[in-house]
Interface confidence: low
């Protein structure tokens, strides 16, 4: 009874199409598959960034796979052939592993790469990234930003840099069509006549770095002798109402500070008849139903009511 064996896939490689971290893993069928013509061969692929503790694993019948990686680190991958049990009259047969690695040869020392990279997607409309020059780099050093996301034919360079002392220290992005809810890849590289500059790679999803505008049209409404309803409106822009969380800060008579987080554009406050002054501010953030993370907006303009009689029906300023 001869043992059934199968070879590993051939020509296993990681291909960089220039998408700043979105890589293709591809391979060819193993040699000597003639015995298994009636069989659908499968491949088990494992891959990870070097230094990661866990492998990502997929099983596929295809001869390619695509995923995003951190190009600041190397990538390692391995693949083997699987013969399902239907092909072997019994148990599944696996080949030995074929292995490959990929990394971008780093230029320059790590200190030369940009520092404190910070990207904010203002009001889900305008992306702005800023950075500080690397440590110890000369004034002739300039940095260039490139970006890519699925839907672009190729990586694009920033066309509207923010400058300080002649150096690029940020980028204002153009309108980014259909760019949220997918990985957004950035590379900031640099050039200098004196020494090589280390590139930096960043990946994020735009909906997770949104900083909304603050809420507007803050108003008071007396609900009862001991309740006042605070109301506000969502800021102008593309973010739907159901995507907001709010934080309120309320000050009564310059003493009590109430803070609360709410999901709607109203908050009911218990008050006493002695209340002489009421002020509140609100800020907004994209909630967990629309993103995995977000940035609080600036606080709204303060809305106050002062006077002897806080029992008027509507208090509006």
């Amino acid at each position: 009874d001869t043992e059934i064996k199968v070879n590993p896939p051939q020509d296993f490689e990681i291909v960089d199409p220039g998408y700043l971290g979105y890589l293709y893993l591809q391979w060819q069928p193993p040699l000597s598959l003639d015995h298994f013509k009636e069989c659908t061969v499968e491949y088990e692929l494992k891959y990870r960034n070097i230094g990661s503790e866990t492998w990502k694993t997929i099983i596929t019948k295809n001869l390619h796979y695509k995923d995003g990686f951190d190009l600041n680190k190397g990538i390692e991958a391995k693949i083997h052939t699987l013969l399902p049990w239907q092909c072997t009259n019994g148990s599944e047969v696996q080949s030995s592993w074929a292995e490959t690695t990929y990394w971008i040869s780093p230029q320059g020392i790590p200190e030369t790469k940009v520092q404190d990279m910070d990207c904010v997607y203002y009001n889900w409309q305008y992306l702005l990234c800023s950075w500080k020059p690397g440590i110890g780099v000369l004034l002739d050093t300039n940095y260039n930003l490139f970006y890519w996301y699925e839907g672009l034919d190729h990586a694009l360079q920033c066309v509207d840099y923010i400058k300080a002392d002649g150096q690029n220290i940020g980028c204002r992005f153009p309108y980014l069509e259909a760019s949220d809810y997918k990985d957004f890849y950035i590379c900031v590289n640099g050039s200098s006549e004196n020494k090589p500059i280390r590139s930096s790679y960043f990946t994020f999803q735009l909906q997770n770095i949104v900083k909304p505008l603050p809420p507007v049209y803050l108003t008071f409404t007396r609900e009862s002798s001991c309740e006042i309803k605070l109301k506000w409106s969502i800021p102008l822009g593309p973010i739907p109402a159901r995507c907001f969380d709010y934080e309120i800060e309320i000050r009564e008579d310059d003493t009590t500070l109430v803070t609360a987080t709410v999901e709607n554009e109203t908050y009911t406050l218990k008050t006493t008849n002695e209340t002489r002054q009421l002020c509140f501010v609100v800020r907004s953030k994209v909630n967990i139903y629309c993103s995995d993370d977000g940035i609080w907006s600036e606080w709204s303009d303060k809305q106050c009511w002062e006077g002897e009689d806080l029992s008027k029906k509507t208090l509006l300023r």
Partner: nanobody, 128 residues
Amino acid sequence: EVQLVESGGGLVQPGGSLRLSCAASGFASDDYIMGWVRQAPGKGLEWVSCISSRYANTYYADSVKGRFTISRDNAKNTLYLQMNSLRPEDTAVYYCAMDSRRVTCPEISTMHRNFDSWGQGTLVTVSS
């Protein structure tokens, strides 16, 4: 009221394929996520896959990555789950679920807790 009706379950041999469908009706929003959640005999609910109505992003549990494909036909308000290379451990009742509060699928294994509408389920049995 949202109604979700699954179909396409059945008995299949290991290595075989099935395509589940879920017909949705009674919802007003254009923005929602839909997904598949399964419950194996004697086990808890396990998230399988999710897709957004507005965006093309899809997420899969590690146990089905590379074998299952989720898709949707917005014109027919129908969700699909193409299941290939089925294994005995895929045996379960598969539920179609929807959440009208979300616009994107969170990539977490407990996300089925967030769905606010559920179908009755369709049984998939993988056995020789």
